[in-house]
């Protein structure tokens, strides 16, 4: 909501999760792994990489089925705590200028830092209009105090807020699982919010920094080659 059409393939780590229709976004973090939101879990997922217009075959797409779909063991569907999911692709993605991985964070998100949010979600705060072309939004990371004040009692240490307290610009339905990137690092995963782009109701995002070890351990445990030291 309130964003702009991204320059074509300018978000090369953005993926679309498809089950006969686009239902969530995701981020490519290595040639064979995608991170998304825990609440985007389905037992069968096709990962679509290199997409810009999800309704048109433009020639840069890679469609790869999920081989493994691993939701965080402490995911809570009521509180949306630990809203993170890993997808292992059935075959490695071909990395090129239009499909490439985003780095995991080396530090937690800092208030005031500009970030890029992207997805094919609803562009209306009231009603529904789903775009075919990837949408981008530049938005600041909010302080934890602002975040907690916006959603009293609902924000865990695994969540943070991004956006505008005045409303008007936000992620929305269809953006879930997609990326929040600051300084070339995947800081957030689109998770939840009360409505979209509402005043004093910023978007809430999974804090990827808290899951770097889980991500690395899960990838290692689900790789063919285990190295024992």
């Amino acid at each position: 909501v309130g964003g702009y059409i991204c320059e074509e393939n300018s978000v090369p780590y953005q993926v679309s999760l498809n089950s006969g229709y686009h239902f969530c976004g995701g981020s490519l973090i290595s040639e064979q792994w995608v991170v998304s939101a825990g609440h985007c879990y389905k037992s069968r997922i096709q990962v679509r990489l290199g997409e810009h217009n999800i309704e048109v075959l433009e020639g840069n797409e890679q469609f790869i089925n999920a081989a493994k779909i691993i939701r965080h063991p402490k995911y809570n569907s009521r509180t949306l705590d630990n809203d993170i999911l890993l997808i292992k692709l059935s075959s490695p993605a071909v990395i090129n200028s239009r499909v490439s991985a985003i780095s995991l964070p080396t530090a937690p998100p800092a208030a005031g830092t500009e970030s890029l949010i992207s997805g094919w979600g609803n562009t209306l705060s009231s009603g529904a209009d789903y775009p075919d072309e990837l949408q981008c939004l530049d938005a600041p990371v909010l302080s934890q105090a602002e975040c907690e004040a916006s959603y009293p009692g609902k924000i865990t240490n695994n969540m943070f807020c991004v956006g505008f307290l005045e409303g008007g610009k936000d992620s929305c339905q269809g953006d879930a699982g997609g990326p929040v990137v600051s300084n070339g690092e995947l800081q957030g995963i689109v998770s939840w919010g009360y409505g979209c782009a509402q005043k004093n109701r910023p978007g809430v995002y999974t804090k990827v920094y808290n899951y770097v070890d889980w991500i690395k351990d899960t990838i290692a445990a689900n790789s063919h080659h285990h190295h024992h030291h």
């Epitope: 089950s19 006969g20 229709y21 686009h22 239902f23 969530c24 939101a37 609440h39 985007c40 879990y41 389905k42 037992s43 069968r44 569907s77 949306l80 979600g121 609803n122 209306l124 009231s126 009603g127 529904a128 209009d129 789903y130 992620s171 929305c172 339905q173 269809g174 953006d175 879930a176 699982g177 689109v190 998770s191 939840w192 919010g193 009360y194 409505g195 979209c196 978007g203």
Partner: antibody, heavy 126, light 106 residues
Amino acid sequence: QVQLQESGPGLVKPSETLSLTCTVSGGSISSHYWHWIRQPAGKGLEWIGRIATSGSTYYNPSLKSRVTMSVDTSKNQFSLKLSSVTAADTAVYYCARDLTNYGITKSIRFYGMDVWGQGTTVTVSS
Amino acid sequence: DIQMTQSPSSLSASVGDRVTITCQASQDISNYLNWYQQKPGKAPKLLIYDASNLETGVPSRFSGSGSGTDFTFTISSLQPEDIATYYCQQVDNFITFGGGTKVEIK
């Protein structure tokens, strides 16, 4: 409270197009998704499709090639067209409101139906 | 397409009995399952959503449980007004209904 009322011809000839309209009263059409469901006499329920007020649609894959749904927010109505009908399309057709008006999670998902019309019987016969 | 297999297709029970209906999905649907009640000549009525959440205004004798592929719907103490056909509905991927279970009084 919100009420739904289906309307349209009760009899349609084979190979023609079935057209139905659902009128929403007691609330705005703009804040929810809207569905069509049908039920042949003495049989189970079949979901036909879902529409948003922008016109964004999702259709049952088995009916997709024959279904068109549209919405008219100024009249608080949404409509169903089903082309090339046969006797197998004879059923009670229901319109219904989506269970939630988008929810708090930001995935695209289906929820179910919490308000239904009383249904209208459509017979396909020459 | 996700298929929903509901059983039994019909049952007869006495007032006050505990009634259980099961629904099996052809693939994992997490908790994306609803239960409806339909009385003759009427539209269906939502009773349970997301497998176990009771819709507002629905009596507490109705309950649901399950996750993944196997789900259960229970009427703890059958009442005469519960005579109806009950349907499960998956909302994980598009929408499909089970075949229905007709509940009658002995």
